[in-house]
Interface confidence: low
């Protein structure tokens, strides 16, 4: 999936299986990514687990779990708030669109999380105070925490190189790691550009991610995934000048 | 059956006296009844998988909300146990007056914390 880190780095990660996105004293978020096509390097998020840790007299530990085709509007225990404690309503789930869009507000840590199902896959966005991000007991153990550190170099796809290579060709090749030859017919480059332009008129990294996803999978739902990801940034990012990210130097692939 | 959708339905019908086409001046009350109905369906969601009435209700509530221009946030027609939180950029606003430090414990050192964002999407 495409990752925008806390430090506004933009990467395309091919990480498969379960990986931690966030891990601190208050909150643990883990995603499971699966290949979008058999044998493909590109992966998308098929499962998301969020653990709100027990906090003083505010909230009991609560676990939220979403999977493909299952975006509940409740924690796994069926509740919609922080439990039986005095401040239980400082943690709340709101269903914005049934089965498609859920918002979780953890006011006791000033955090808002947006989870969506777009097409078959999940998207995740969070707004969190730096103070919470930094509330970690043991920094040495924070090695593979994607939102903070990004994904390892060997797990990144240089989708901008792919973008450059495929311009005008309609090719399906995925730089150093191509999707399975059995991939369904994908879009010609021009069609992908047109579809992405429709939803994402600014040619930023969200637009480029959209083009990459259409060329890789042929699944138009990924256009919406990029669109909603940008919409969530607009709602959640505190620096309105940093809504759009653009291609910078080539030292960090996909940044 | 643990699925309480028929209870939700009957509460909605009681609240609206069976009217699906309220006069324009009834719309706020109708919207409040719809929001209560939506809340009721959400509370019974986990026990209603596969229940035809539940899925009909969920789709229908969305239809009716848009038909009558009801906002998703706002008062409900039952006691306001869980009004939806205000949308947008207002993470620090309190939902209810009785919650004290649980609302603000994360920024005890600074009036307005520095927020940061992380997102994951697509392939």
């Amino acid at each position: 999936p495409h990752l925008r880190t806390f430090t506004d780095r933009f990467q395309t990660c091919k990480v498969q299986g379960a990986w931690p996105l966030i891990d601190n004293n208050y909150l643990n978020v883990q995603v499971t990514n699966t290949p979008v096509l058999p044998g493909s390097a590109a992966t998308a998020t098929s499962k998301l687990t969020i653990i709100f840790k027990n906090f003083q007299e505010c909230v009991d530990q609560k676990v939220y779990q979403a999977e493909m085709d299952e975006l509940p509007a409740a924690f796994v225990d069926g509740s919609k708030n922080g439990g039986d404690k005095h401040g239980a309503n400082s943690l709340k789930i709101t269903e914005k669109v049934s089965g498609q869009h859920v918002e979780i507000r953890a006011k006791y840590i000033g955090t808002t999380i947006v989870v969506r199902q777009v097409g078959r896959y999940l998207t995740f966005a969070v707004r969190v105070p730096e103070e919470v991000v930094n509330a970690v007991e043991d920094w040495d153990s924070q090695g593979l925490y994607l939102c903070l550190r990004g994904c390892p170099l060997n797990q990144q796809i240089d989708f901008q190189a792919f973008h450059t290579n495929t311009e005008g060709t309609g090719a399906r090749r995925l730089a150093a790691a191509s999707p399975a030859p059995t991939a369904p017919e994908t879009f010609p480059y021009e069609t992908a550009v047109a579809k992405c332009k429709e939803k994402l008129p600014v040619e930023d990294l969200y637009y480029q991610a959209c083009v990459f996803d259409l060329l890789t999978t042929g699944d138009v739902n990924f256009t919406l995934a990029a669109y909603y990801a940008l919409e969530d940034v607009k709602m959640l990012h505190s620096n309105k000048d940093k809504l759009h990210l653009y291609e910078r130097t080539r030292d960090l692939p996909g940044r | 059956s643990p699925c309480k959708i028929l209870k939700c339905n009957s509460e909605f019908w009681s609240a609206t006296s069976g009217s699906h086409a309220p006069a324009s001046d009834d719309t706020p009350e109708f919207c409040a009844a719809l929001r209560s109905y939506a809340l009721c369906t959400r509370r019974t969601a986990r026990t209603c998988r596969g229940d035809l009435a539940y899925h009909s209700a969920v789709h229908g509530i969305e239809d009716l909300m848009s038909q009558h221009n009801c906002s998703k946030d706002g008062p409900t027609s039952q006691p306001r146990l869980h009004t939806l939180p205000p949308a947008g950029d207002s993470q620090e606003r309190s939902d209810s007056p009785e919650i004290c430090h649980c609302e603000k414990s994360f920024h005890k050192h600074s009036a307005t914390p520095n927020y940061t964002h992380c997102g994951l999407f697509g392939d």
């Epitope: - | 028929l6 339905n9 009957s10 069976g18 998988r49 229940d51 035809l52 009435a53 899925h55 009909s56």
Partner: antibody, heavy 120, light 109 residues
Framework: EVQLVQSGAEVKKPGASVKVSCKAS????????ISWVRQAPGQGLDWMGW????????NYAQKLQGRVTMTTDTSTSTAYMELSSLRSEDTAVYYC?????????????WGQGTLVTVSS | QSALTQPRSVSGSPGQSVTISCTGT?????????VSWYQQHPGKAPKLMLY???KRPSGVPDRFSGSKSGNTASLTISGLQAEDEADYYC?????????FGGGTKVTVL
Amino acid sequence: EVQLVQSGAEVKKPGASVKVSCKASGYTFTSHGISWVRQAPGQGLDWMGWISPYSGNTNYAQKLQGRVTMTTDTSTSTAYMELSSLRSEDTAVYYCARVGSGPYYYMDVWGQGTLVTVSS
Amino acid sequence: QSALTQPRSVSGSPGQSVTISCTGTSSSVGDSIYVSWYQQHPGKAPKLMLYDVTKRPSGVPDRFSGSKSGNTASLTISGLQAEDEADYYCVSYAGTDTLFGGGTKVTVL
């Protein structure tokens, strides 16, 4: 125009399976459930079950549990009903019907019907 | 044996009113707002005439009306016309089952 178009007539032997399709057009397929109803010759209507194309959730009539499978393909807006271990009493016209969207339940649009004949 | 009981047939002259009853239990009809009625002409697919006991979809003439008393729902056709000759089925949704009546043949004399 909202329409449900069903597959053509089938003749099957006892013990076999039949799969009837129902292609929807003119509306958002995932916004409405699909019910299946059958009618034996000269008899009344008999409800078989329901599927939500949105979630894939199904709800089958008790007496058909284990023999009926309802599926949908949202990419083609098509619902399918498969009935296995066919017997002569399964000879009937099989209808698909759209479940009206709302906090109300009814079948507001029907397919033209598919005659399934089970005969040795 | 249907879960909802309807008379096998009713008849009336053009212009007259006829009423078809549909009797069930408290859970299938009495407490249900999900009672609908369908018209079926020979060799044709059923057509929705009423839903939620009393509501008429657009395109259905206002001579068709519905009501419910206790565990019995009723469909009334007032000002009977030749094209109303058909089979009529009541349907109720109860719990997780959809129940059909046995059907009533309406004959226009």
